[in-house]
Interface confidence: low
Amino acid sequence: TCEIVTLDRDSSQPRRTIARQTARCACRKGQIAGTTRARPACVDARIIKTKQWCDMLPCLEGEGCDLLINRSGWTCTQPGGRIKTTTVS
């Protein structure tokens, strides 16, 4: 089970919204807090270790997931071509 602890939004830049989200999850052994279908979820810890972010299915149904080149996060591409970028810190 997971709950969102903080959610900050910054819409000051044109055509770009920056959102920072922190979630707290109670996960089983071998799992860790992650994102599934754009919501906080418990995911296999190996996904986080190997930075294979797309393996936790972070995008919404119908969106395409692609790793950022240096594995610092992922992009979700909507059918219309709009891209949402998520970085992990």
């Epitope: 930075k51 692609d66 950022l68 240096n70 992009t75 970028t85």
Partner: antibody, heavy 114, light 110 residues
């Protein structure tokens, strides 16, 4: 890493270049094709993932196709060649952890001329 | 389309000087940048990946820094053998930006 297949061709002719690797497997490594026109800079053409997913530079889409033909060979198929495609073509192993290409072949020269 | 603006196009330095080459990306590339050295008639060799990670076997006088859209390759105490052309290669996602090389910087040692 070694490229082969470069030669003199006339405009409009298709050409396939082959990249042969040893010491590692294409089932776990990314491979990119890069070209360099005489006296010019480097130009990224595209990449093939271990899963065989391919991505291309916008200018290369449609005319260039990268495919894996075995666990040790990757091909670059080029169609509708023009004199602008005259270049040395390099095959390079790409790291899946960054944009770095850490192992390059010596290149193969393609000359397009009438 | 991602554009990598590399400056300067060429420079001349004396042995022992510090050389800086800059690459400016047209959009945030999330440290997805690598740096290469190329000598005449040879393929490029990787120096730095992920903006600041020194490739194994590369002398520690080479270093990379930067974030967002602004990145720098620094050669601290340049040596005669560092005469070459240097390229940055940037991009953050193969599917959206792909990879783009900078135009190159020709480094001459006086």
């Amino acid at each position: 890493v070694e490229e082969s297949g470069g030669r003199l061709v006339t405009p409009g002719t298709p050409l396939t270049l082959t990249c042969t690797v040893s010491g590692f497997s294409l089932s776990s490594d990314y491979m990119s094709w890069v070209r360099q026109a005489p006296g010019e800079g480097l130009e990224w053409i595209g990449i093939i993932y271990p899963s065989t997913t391919t991505y291309y530079a916008s200018w290369a889409k449609g005319r260039f196709t990268i495919s894996k033909t075995s666990s040790t060979t990757v091909e670059l198929k080029m169609t509708s060649l023009t004199t602008e495609d005259t270049a040395t073509y390099f095959c390079a192993r790409g790291s899946n952890w960054s944009s770095g290409m850490n192992l390059w072949g010596p290149g193969t020269l393609v000359t397009v001329s009438s | 389309e991602l554009v990598m603006t590399q400056t300067p196009p060429s420079l001349s330095a004396s042995v022992g000087e510090t050389v800086r080459i800059r690459c400016l990306a047209s959009e945030d590339i999330y440290s997805g940048i690598s740096w290469y050295q190329q000598k005449p008639e040879k393929p490029p060799t990787l120096l730095i990946s992920g903006a600041s990670n020194l490739e194994s076997g590369v002398p520690p006088r080479f270093s990379g820094s930067g974030s967002g859209t602004d990145y720098t390759l620094t050669i601290g105490g340049v040596q005669a053998e560092d005469a070459a052309t240097y390229y940055c290669l940037g991009g953050y996602s193969y599917s959206s930006t792909g990879l783009t090389f900078g135009a190159g910087t020709n480094v001459e040692i006086k």
